[in-house]
Each structure stands twice: as structure tokens, then as C-alpha cells.
């Protein structure tokens, strides 16, 4: 099943997020992703856990998954690099870099997103944008077009309360509020964008969605700048 959904969001403006990628398995949307360099897409490591025998590709320049669009192009993956410390049973280090078979053709609908390199927490309350093609309601309806939602960043102390994530949120993770509006599983690997800069990647751990006591968890890209740089180099 696809790993991702946006709950309580709305359809995104077409091609207004030219960094947005759909990581696909055997031609079907699996996870979100974000173009961080001409030939590299950042996503979540857990996305490829069940993809051993399948064909992984990356769709760029898309708004609709099914309709023809001039900017849409499907790229093969030359190399998949999960973070060496990612493990199936934890949400830690849940990052994946996908090297496209060739440099993406850039244009108004396909453009890398600057990512945060300064390793400081985003201020609580900051409104950040998360987008994806995941399921849009609890009944499991999958959207054809890209959805998005604005979410306020939640401070780590609150997120780590026993009633919330009970200490699981390390310095390398961040949280966003999840009161009816939320990202979830199937949007894993997608971008959390604050002030036009990539700050987080949706983690792909299983979690109840849209419940304010179970905030959304995102991997802080700034904490992994050294690893990202070392792979992209």
C-alpha cells in the first residue's frame, strides 16, 4: 500500500511546488520526495523497505498522477542510498537519497529546493507546508492531484510528553501539530517546508493520523547536512 496521506488539507496550486517528487514502485505512487539537487531526490529510508524486487522510479514535474502534463517526467533511479543507521524498527535516521539516472530537466515546474544547513530548531508555532499524494481521509481515498496542508511546528518538550511521543523525539527530529490536519504514513519522504526552505522530511513510522496527541514526526535535514553533502559530492 502507498505510504502516505495528507489529512485535512486541500489541493495544491498546480506546479507551485516544483521540488515535489513522487517516489514510485512498479508505476504506482509509494512515497513523497523532494528534489534537493539536479540529480538527487531526498525521501525516507523506510519507503524502500518492501521494494526489494520492484522497479523504483521518481516522478517529477507532476500535479496529477494520472493525467498527461507537459512538465511531467519519470526518471529511473541509478542509485538508492539509505542512511546507514536507518533501521526497520525505529524512526531515527529515516532518510534516503535517490540518484536519478540523469540530471533532471529543470524548468518552472521542476526545481531543487534549498535545504536547511544551519542546525537550529525551527521556532515553535512556525507555519510550515507539507505536501503529498497520500490518502485524504480515514476511508482511504487516494487523491490524483497533489494535496498540501499548513501545520504549526510543535516544541520538542511537548511532543516528548508521556501522553504524546514519550521521549522518542531526539534532537534530530521535529514535530508538527496534528489536530485533524496532518501528514501521515503514505506521505513519508515528502517535504516539510518552512519559509521556502526544506526543514524536515516526513518520517515513515506507523502512527495514528489526525490525533492532536500524536503529532507528526519529521526528520530534521539540517542535522544530516554532513551525510547529505557527503553523498551528493
Amino acid at each position: 500500500p502507498p505510504r502516505g496521506r495528507i489529512l485535512g488539507g486541500r489541493e495544491a496550486e498546480a506546479h507551485a511546488r516544483p521540488y515535489m517528487a513522487s517516489v514510485q514502485l512498479n508505476g504506482a505512487h509509494l512515497c513523497g520526495g523532494v528534489l534537493v539537487a539536479e540529480q538527487w531526490v531526498l525521501s525516507a529510508a523506510h519507503c524502500l523497505e518492501d521494494a526489494a524486487d520492484g522497479k523504483v522510479q521518481v516522478l517529477l514535474g507532476a500535479h496529477s498522477l494520472s493525467q498527461p502534463e507537459p512538465s511531467k517526467r519519470l526518471y529511473d533511479v541509478l542509485r538508492a542510498v539509505p542512511h546507514p543507521d536507518s533501521q526497520p524498527d525505529t524512526i531515527d535516521h529515516d532518510l534516503l537519497l535517490l540518484q536519478l539516472s540523469e540530471k533532471a530537466t529543470l524548468g518552472p515546474a521542476v526545481r531543487p529546493l534549498p535545504w536547511q544547513r544551519v542546525d537550529r530548531d525551527v521556532a515553535p508555532g512556525t507555519l510550515c507546508d507539507v505536501a503529498g499524494w497520500g490518502i485524504v481521509n480515514h476511508a482511504g481515498r487516494r487523491p490524483d492531484s497533489l494535496q498540501h496542508v499548513l501545520l504549526p511546528v510543535l516544541d520538542r518538550a511537548t511532543c516528548n510528553r508521556r501522553t504524546h511521543h514519550d521521549g522518542a523525539i531526539t534532537e534530530r527530529l521535529m514535530c508538527a501539530e496534528s489536530n485533524r490536519r496532518d501528514s501521515c504514513k503514505g506521505d513519508s519522504g515528502g517535504p516539510l517546508v518552512c519559509g521556502g526552505v526544506l526543514e524536515g522530511v516526513v518520517t515513515s513510522g506507523s502512527r495514528v493520523c489526525g490525533n492532536r496527541k500524536k503529532p507528526g514526526i519529521y526528520t530534521r535535514v539540517a542535522s544530516y547536512a554532513a551525510w547529505i553533502d557527503s553523498v551528493l559530492a
Epitope: D119, E171, A226, S230, A233
Partner: antibody, heavy 122, light 107 residues
Framework: QVQLQQSGAELARPGASVKMSCKAS????????IHWVKQRPGQGLEWIGY????????HYNQKFRDKAALTADKSSSTAYMQLSSLTSEDSAVYNC???????????????WGAGTTVTVSS | DIVMTQAHRFMSTSVGDRVIISCKAS??????VAWYQQTPGQSPKILIY???TRHTGVPDRFTGSRSGTDFTLTISNVQSEDLADYFC?????????FGGGTKLEIK
């Protein structure tokens, strides 16, 4: 054989600048990332920063941002580091280094230059 | 910045012995730790990367391991040529940082 050959020792006055070089051989220079590391006698190692030769991107340790400037001349396969406003604290051995390994992730260093000794004295 | 602490500045051992050199990270660094050997007058030489992967040509008497934020370099069957400084390095996040070093002395 992959090698990094560094320029000779430098003696400089306080307040002056020095520019040292690191010449690579045995591999495709323009596709690698050259890091610089400082070592003072009897002390540990300090990472200064790097220059990615593929895209000319530099990343500095904040501590050295106003001290070091990293450049390269790809035509001669040579990387340079200029240290400015020298003080006695800058007296040290400076090594260039890079990761050759086929692992292709993580900034560890399996090729090192022999080092350039900088002495700052009035 | 992540601080890498090598508690023992000096360690003394005998040829044939087994010695454990430790390094503690001030916060989680995953397995992104390397170990280097530096003999007098030489540049550092890599021994181990990703906590436990031995670099090409490094004798198998050198092994690396981890428990949480504690990292160890074990040298079994110490040889006289192992007399050197040993440094750990984390490369999980910027700035990359090194331990202060442990000088291994042969009795």
C-alpha cells in the same frame, strides 16, 4: 598511486597571511572534495572545512570562517588554503585530506597530505 | 558542536596484549565514527570507518565497536609498530570533530 603533496613550511609574522597548497595526483582531481585539518603540537585535530571541486561549494567550520579561505586551480590539480590575520594560535600543522573510498558516504578521510607546518612568530 | 572525549590521554601496554581505546560522543552520532592512527612525524592513517568497517589493508587485529554513544577501538595482539596516537572522529553532523587522542605506549 593517489597522493596529496603539500607545500613547504611557512614562517610568518603576526597579522600576516599565508597561502599553502595541496597538489593531487593519481586520480581525477575535479570530482573530489578536499578537506583541511589543523593539528597543534600535542593536541587533537580540528576540521577547518572543505571545497567540493565538482561544484566549487565550500563549507567551513564556523570557528574558521573568518580565518581560512579555500580555493582551487583545477588545471593544475591543486587546492589552496589561505590563512589570514595570523596569531600564535595559528601555529600548527595543516593537512589536506579526502575520502577516496568507494563507500561514497560519510566524511572520513583515507588519503592525507604530509602537512604544512605554519609558525607564527615576531 | 559534538564533543568526542577520549578519557585516556596515555595508555601503556605490552607486545602481545589486548588494549581497548575508548571515545565518548556528547550526543547521538549513530555509527558515523572513524578511527585514525598517527605515528610520530606522520599524517593520520585511517583504520576504521562507520564504527566497525576496517579500511583496506588494515590488519584484523584492529576492531571497532559501539554501545550507544560509547565507541571503542580494540587492538588485539599489540605489535611494536602500533606505538602511535589514536584519534576518533565523528562525521554525523557539522562541524566534523575529533577526539583529543590517546597515545599508546609500549612497555
Amino acid at each position: 598511486q593517489v597522493q596529496l603533496q603539500q607545500s613547504g613550511a611557512e614562517l610568518a609574522r603576526p597579522g600576516a597571511s599565508v597561502k599553502m597548497s595541496c597538489k593531487a595526483s593519481g586520480y581525477t582531481f575535479a570530482t573530489y572534495t578536499i578537506h583541511w585539518v589543523k593539528q597543534r603540537p600535542g593536541q587533537g585535530l580540528e576540521w577547518i572545512g572543505y571545497l567540493n571541486l565538482r561544484n566549487d561549494y565550500t563549507h567551513y567550520n564556523q570557528k574558521f570562517r573568518d580565518k581560512a579561505a579555500l580555493t582551487a586551480d583545477k588545471s593544475s590539480s591543486t587546492a589552496y588554503m589561505q590563512l589570514s590575520s595570523l596569531t600564535s594560535e595559528d601555529s600548527a600543522v595543516y593537512n589536506c585530506a579526502f575520502r577516496l573510498g568507494n563507500d561514497r558516504q560519510g566524511w572520513y578521510f583515507d588519503v592525507w597530505g604530509a602537512g604544512t607546518t605554519v609558525t607564527v612568530s615576531s | 558542536d559534538i564533543v568526542m572525549t577520549q578519557a585516556h590521554r596515555f595508555m601503556s601496554t605490552s607486545v602481545g596484549d589486548r588494549v581497548i581505546i575508548s571515545c565518548k560522543a556528547s550526543q547521538d552520532v549513530g555509527t558515523a565514527v572513524a578511527w585514525y592512527q598517527q605515528t610520530p612525524g606522520q599524517s593520520p592513517k585511517i583504520l576504521i570507518y562507520w564504527t566497525s568497517t576496517r579500511h583496506t589493508g588494515v590488519p584484523d587485529r584492529f576492531t571497532g565497536s559501539r554501545s550507544g554513544t560509547d565507541f571503542t577501538l580494540t587492538i588485539s595482539n599489540v605489535q611494536s609498530e602500533d606505538l602511535a596516537d589514536y584519534f576518533c572522529q565523528q562525521y554525523t553532523t557539522y562541524p566534523l570533530t575529533f577526539g583529543g587522542g590517546t597515545k599508546l605506549e609500549i612497555k
